[in-house]
Interface confidence: low
């Protein structure tokens, strides 16, 4: 015998309370495949999350982040605070890149300048907090006295890579450090 629920298309659920009639998903819920016995609650984009794609009866909503934050994680499960170029996010907020490192984006960590001498090249343009050095021809290709050697990049300070970053995700935009996961979303009910 064919399961009567298999006839229920996406956007509906097989309602056991009504003789397995295919009922439309209630507001703020969806089913992306046919034959479902329940509809899933739509993802909601609150706080620093912004709706990129509205929920429909057949597909979940998609979120991105409000200005000043960027997405992290699968499906933008977290929003991380932007920093300026030349900075990285630490647990004390945005901090300037230390000497010998740079970051040319609003996210991520400061990375050491390229060591031109490792490739047998010289520094053509000095590095800054925002930009890597530009390596030029090798010293041998230059006339005597014209060579320039970059000092080796300093070792990164221990613990200066991203620590306890300002991540904000959906579950509980509700205490003290802003480090939240999406785990309990399915518990939220419309009331």
């Amino acid at each position: 015998l064919q399961d009567p629920c298999s006839n229920c298309p996406a956007g509906t659920f097989c309602d056991n309370n009504r003789n397995q009639i295919c009922s439309p998903c209630p507001p703020n819920s969806f089913s992306s495949a046919g034959g479902q016995r329940t509809c899933d609650i739509c993802r909601q984009c609150k706080g620093v999350f912004r709706t990129r794609k509205e929920c429909s009866s057949t597909s979940n909503a998609e979120c991105d982040c409000t200005p000043g934050f960027h997405c992290l994680g699968a499906g933008c499960s977290m929003c991380e605070q932007d920093c300026k170029q030349g900075q990285e996010l630490t647990k004390k907020g945005c901090k300037d890149c230390c000497f010998g490192t740079f970051n040319d984006q609003k996210r991520g960590i400061c990375r050491p300048w390229t060591n031109c001498s490792l490739d047998g090249k010289s520094v053509l343009v000095n590095g800054t907090k925002e930009r890597d050095v530009v390596c030029g021809p090798s010293p041998a290709d230059l006339s005597p006295g014209a060579s320039s050697v970059t000092p080796p990049a300093p070792a990164r300070e221990p613990g200066h890579s991203p620590q306890e970053q300002k991540l904000i995700s959906e579950e509980d935009l509700g205490g003290e450090q802003k480090l939240i996961s999406e785990e309990d979303l399915h518990h939220h009910h419309h009331h």
Epitope: E171, H187, H190
Partner: antibody, heavy 125, light 108 residues
């Protein structure tokens, strides 16, 4: 009827401990995030602590962190606040409050939509 | 943390008056702003959520408006039961949940 009822308040000496309870009725307690909010005599509202519906995520105000512990027992429809190392400045009416979630057309809003009647904690020698 | 500042701290008005209370956030909170009413010896009661949405059971003489950093709660025609303290609360960036310091509405 949707209701929250607190208990456990009383007079305690500085450095002492108390455990507040909040019992829910009229709604599916395990589906809701919960908060404790307090109000010192003649003062405004101050958020104290938060717990997610499953109890996996917890937050505290800086003024109580390390001294207070929030917990919940969904089977008993109960929320708790364990208060240690109490100080005179913890004297207040303590309210438990349900965090209601409201689906807007685009966003997901929340507000403290159900409050208990409050229980009074007095810290004095 | 986001700071919420209400004004005035207290105000006197008469039954039938139109009353406006303002709340300012220290940074933009979009429309993530709630208003509560508290009567002496009682728990706070949610009046308005999402800046302008009236909570179920709240009389229509209450209304909220605003977005970003500036919000208002308006009571169009004051009734005797409306004399109370009113609090705004942001729900944009939490924790912590932060409230305004309150506005006490008294009978003139």
């Amino acid at each position: 009827e949707v209701q929250l009822v607190e208990s456990g308040g009383g007079l305690v000496q500085p450095g002492g401990s108390l455990r507040l309870s909040c019992v829910a009725s009229g709604f599916t307690f395990s589906s809701y995030e919960m908060n404790w909010v307090r109000q010192a005599p003649g003062k405004g509202l101050e958020w104290v602590s938060y717990i997610s519906n499953s109890g996996t995520t917890i937050y505290y105000a800086g003024s109580v962190k390390g001294r207070f512990t929030i917990s919940r027992d969904n089977a008993k429809k109960s929320l708790y606040l364990h208060m240690n190392s109490l100080r005179a400045e913890d004297t207040a009416v303590y309210y438990c409050a349900r965090e209601g979630t409201i689906f807007g057309t685009v966003h997901y809003y929340f507000a403290l939509d159900v409050w208990g009647q409050g229980t009074t904690v007095t810290v004095s020698s | 943390d986001i700071q919420m500042t209400q004004s005035p701290s207290s105000l006197s008005a008469s039954v039938g008056d139109r009353v406006t209370i303002t709340c300012r956030a220290s940074q933009s909170i979009s429309s993530y702003l709630n208003w509560y009413q508290q009567k002496p010896g009682k728990a706070p009661k949610l009046l308005i959520y999402a800046a302008s949405s009236l909570q179920s059971g709240v009389p229509s003489r209450f209304s909220g408006s605003g977005s970003g950093t500036d919000f208002t709660l308006t009571i169009s025609s004051l009734q005797p039961e409306d004399f109370a303290t009113y609090y705004c609360q942001q729900s944009y960036s939490t924790p912590p949940i932060t409230f305004g310091q309150g506005t006490r509405l008294e009978i003139k």
